[in-house]
């Protein structure tokens, strides 16, 4: 991925919360590229040694993934081309809470954005009619 220019691209994240034991979504969007093979997505968690997830050249690249996330992450591969870099996190744990970075490289340039992810036992509010 030596093709990326020196320009910045816009990356947008949204703070979110995950229910322990359920699946969660870490939301991230970016300026799309016309070639999937030119897009690199890296998810990092502050303080964690390995990567949370990496997607490059049209597929997952998980050789550098931290073991705390092994088997628990996925991007929406068919939506990457339209600028969706959101991460699905399976079986959310209390220790998944923290600051995450969505880092994007495309032929247009690079960009990143952070998001705060909270975890807990959240319940849907009851509606009494």
């Amino acid at each position: 991925f030596g093709i990326s220019g020196r320009h910045s691209i816009t990356v947008t994240t949204v703070a979110s919360a995950g229910n322990i034991g359920e699946d969660g979504i870490l939301s991230c969007t970016f300026e799309p590229d016309i070639k999937l093979s030119d897009i690199v997505i890296q998810w990092l968690k502050e303080g964690v040694l390995g990567l949370v997830h990496e997607f490059k050249e049209g597929k997952d690249e998980l050789s550098e993934q931290d073991e705390m996330f092994r088997g628990r992450t996925a991007v929406f591969a068919d939506q990457v081309i339209v600028g969706n870099a959101s991460l699905r996190l399976k079986n959310v744990q209390l220790t998944d809470a923290g600051t995450y970075k969505c880092y994007i490289i495309t032929s247009k340039g690079k960009g990143n954005a952070n998001l705060e992810y909270k975890t807990g036992a959240f319940s849907m509010p009851e509606v009494n009619v």
Epitope: F1, E46, G47, V48, L49, T95, N112
Partner: antibody, heavy 117, light 107 residues
């Protein structure tokens, strides 16, 4: 203020032992992997060891493997480096550093370890 | 182990100069490259992480570029406080390794 403060350095004879401490403040210590990095007098930086945020993974430089042990006590917000079988070539300033975004983002001021007979 | 080679090992420059330091990895390290500044008697300070991301509080005259094996740290207009030693560091595999350093001196 985010801060790391090393202590425990000093003069020790070859073959001796020393335990370094690094007191952390101003951040959630238990959420971060932590490193030790050293610098021999007039030389460059050398990574020594790392411990993951939960203490489950530890990695060492070949030069210290089997002699040094990294550990942490999250209840005390403190990182440790137990150094045994010290050699003259272990003489250096030892820094503790926080693992941020894939990098050493916060460093302590360093503590000098001198190994000499 | 991944070897990191910095060049030059030292350079002389004047205030206002554009300064470029290069770092080469012995194998592909993607964008997992960091740059640090160290002044005599002080701890190192993180400048750039992930090859090109500027650490908070670091002046915008510092920039990083590159991927794979070849990386560059650029100081667009050297300031008096920038005279120091600069180190690159790979973060892709253990043992983590540093370049030998580049000392930036006053001409």
């Amino acid at each position: 203020e985010v801060q790391l403060l090393e202590s425990g350095g000093g003069l020790v004879k070859p073959g001796g032992s020393l335990r370094l401490s690094c007191a952390a403040s101003g951040f959630t210590f238990s959420s971060y992997a932590m490193h030790w990095v050293r610098q021999a007098p007039g030389k460059g930086l050398e990574w020594v060891a790392v411990i993951s945020y939960d203490g489950s993974n530890k990695y060492y430089a070949d030069s210290v493997k089997g002699r040094f042990t990294i550990s942490r006590d999250d209840s005390k917000n403190t990182l440790y480096l137990q150094m045994n079988s010290l050699k003259t070539e272990d003489t250096a300033v030892y820094y503790c550093a926080r693992h941020g975004w894939d990098a050493f983002d916060i460093w302590g001021q360093g503590t000098l370890v001198t190994v000499s007979s | 182990d991944i070897q990191m080679t910095q060049s030059p090992s030292s350079l002389s420059a004047s205030v206002g100069d554009r300064v470029t330091i290069t770092c080469r990895a012995s194998q592909d390290i993607s964008n997992r490259l960091n740059w640090y500044q160290q002044k005599p008697g002080k701890a190192p300070k993180l400048l750039i992480y992930l090859a090109s991301s500027l650490q908070g509080g670091v002046p915008s005259r510092f920039s990083g570029s590159g991927s794979g094996t070849d990386f560059t740290l650029t100081i667009s207009s050297l300031q008096p406080e920038d005279f120091a030693t600069y180190y690159c560091q790979q973060a892709i595999s253990f043992p983590l390794t540093f370049g030998g350093g580049t000392k930036v001196e006053i001409k």
